[in-house]
Each structure stands twice: as structure tokens, then as C-alpha cells.
């Protein structure tokens, strides 16, 4: 099966790499514009230059193209705790990230929020905090993991999953009580 190609891909595939087919004359291959520029006018004929113009401030193209307009620069989302790692240039979009000791939680493919890395109080760091993943904690004896925090087994209710983790602690308490009654 031949994969389906869109009209633009079909037109481009007729020309060698780095060129595109003239939209009004399919016998002409025009040179694509470099990154940081956009297509102002198609080449007038074979071997003639494509008219490419540099992107204006606040816009960019990150690869060779024949776009009629540059792409708008992304803005970092302050409400999601994002900070600007590098500002937008004519050939590169804004790079957004998180502060030190924070990680990204992706709500969707292109939307992330910054959260503080867990410190593993009353536990130890099993896996360090990564760019896109919180610290993985292992809790000390007498503590259980709840919402990635080590919580005292004294807060463990019978109905919760923690009963399995806190069972030895509970049994030890019972054993101590029993030995005290003899």
C-alpha cells in the first residue's frame, strides 16, 4: 500500500530536495526559503531566485520552507508556572521550561504545568526528579506512600491500601501490648 500524500507533499516530491514545485507552473522547481525566512514571491522561472524575506520580530520559521507567513512565537504560560529558557529568534521558537527542582506535568501534548519535586521527607529518594517526572520516594518503616509523600502509619485507616504496608507496624504494636499483659 502506498501511503496517502497530501497535495503539498505530492507537489514537493516531484522536485529535488530543497526545492518545491511552483504553484502556478508545475514544470518549475523553486528553491525553498532558509529557516528564519518565509516565501514572499515564488521564483519567476527555472534557475531564478525565490524571493524570501526574513521573519519579523515575534515570528519564526525553524526549517527550510515555502510558507507564506512566518509562525507566531510561543509564549510561556506563567499561570502554569512556566519560565522562558530561551527567547524566540527568527529561526527558533521560544523554549519554555520549569525552574530548578521542578518537573513538567503534561496535561496534553503541548501543554505542561510545573510542579515542585517531592523531597521524600520520612523516606529516601528511589529515583531522582527528572524533567518530566517527579521524584520516586521509598518510605521509611512506619510510613506509607500517599500522593508521593511519606505519611505516618498512624494515619492509616483500615479501608485504605496502606494497611498492607503498615501491617507489620500494627502487628508489632499488638505484640507489645500482649506481652505487657502477662
Amino acid at each position: 500500500l502506498v501511503p496517502h500524500l497530501g497535495d503539498r507533499e505530492k507537489r514537493d516530491s516531484v522536485c529535488p530536495q530543497g526545492k518545491y514545485i511552483h504553484p502556478q507552473n508545475n514544470s518549475i522547481c523553486c528553491t525553498k526559503c532558509h529557516k528564519g525566512t518565509y516565501l514572499y514571491n515564488d521564483c519567476p522561472g527555472p534557475g531564478q531566485d525565490t524571493d524570501c524575506r526574513e521573519c519579523e520580530s515575534g515570528s519564526f520559521t525553524a526549517s527550510e520552507n515555502h510558507l507564506r507567513h512566518c509562525l507566531s512565537c510561543s509564549k510561556c504560560r506563567k499561570e502554569m508556572g512556566q519560565v522562558e529558557i530561551s527567547s524566540c529568534t527568527v529561526d527558533r521558537d521560544t523554549v519554555c521550561g520549569c525552574r530548578k527542582n521542578q518537573y513538567r506535568h503534561y496535561w496534553s501534548e503541548n501543554l505542561f504545568q510545573c510542579f515542585n519535586c517531592s523531597l521524600c521527607l520520612n523516606g529516601t529518594v528511589h529515583l531522582s526528579c527528572q524533567e518530566k517526572q517527579n521524584t520516586v520516594c521509598t518510605c521509611h518503616a512506619g510510613f506509607f506512600l500517599r500522593e508521593n509523600e511519606c505519611v505516618s502509619c498512624s494515619n492509616c485507616k483500615k479501608s485504605l491500601e496502606c494497611t498492607k504496608l503498615c501491617l507489620p507496624q500494627i502487628e508489632n504494636v499488638k505484640g507489645t501490648e500482649d506481652s505487657g499483659t502477662t
Epitope: H105, W107, S108, E109, N110, L111, Q113, F115, E147, N148
Partner: nanobody, 120 residues
Amino acid sequence: EVQLLESGGGLVQPGGSLRLSCAASGFTFTRYSMGWVRQAPGKGLEWVSMIDVPGLHTYYADSVKGRFTISRDNSKNTLYLQMNSLRAEDTAVYYCAKISQFGSNAFDYWGQGTLVTVSS
């Protein structure tokens, strides 16, 4: 077919509380983050809150931080929004929304909405 059915809206006095619910069906609830969006009269849509599947990550708009609490019950396929210390500016239609995993649009399905009116 994805269905999101909101309930719990109504008229409440400033300083009062309401709890909105959203019953979800037609998709695997435990695979998607969920959220609440609102639209005040004559205004655009505003994200209110979001929650991931296990409830470990939440987002709140600055305008509702400390007053609203989002939660979910995965066993009941239900999303909640507890709204306390309500203000006149919280008057809006509140929509339950399923968060898309792809693309730049956060939400891909919405409910019909429930009207919250804060007035004395």
C-alpha cells in the same frame, strides 16, 4: 459517544458554597485528565481547574485558588468542583471537560453546562 452531564448549579448568596458534579460516560474515564471551564455572561471561556487521573496533579486559575477544590471519583466516573466563598464574579455557566491527550487544545469534549449565579 462521549457524554458529560453537569449538575449542582443554582442561585447562591455571596460567601456561599456549591458543589458541582459531572457524570461521564462513553469513554474510559480512568485514562483521561478532566477539568472545569466557565463562561461568564458576555465574556470568553476561562479555565477554572484540571485534575489528572490519580488526582496527584491539579491546576487552579488564580481567580479561584484557595476557594475551589477539584476532585474525582474514578469508581463512579464522576468529576466534582467544590466552590466555597463564592463571589459575584464567579457567576457563569460551568462546563465539565475531557482533556485531550494530543494537540494544543486542552479540551476535546464538553458538557452542556450548569449555570451558577452568585447574587444577594
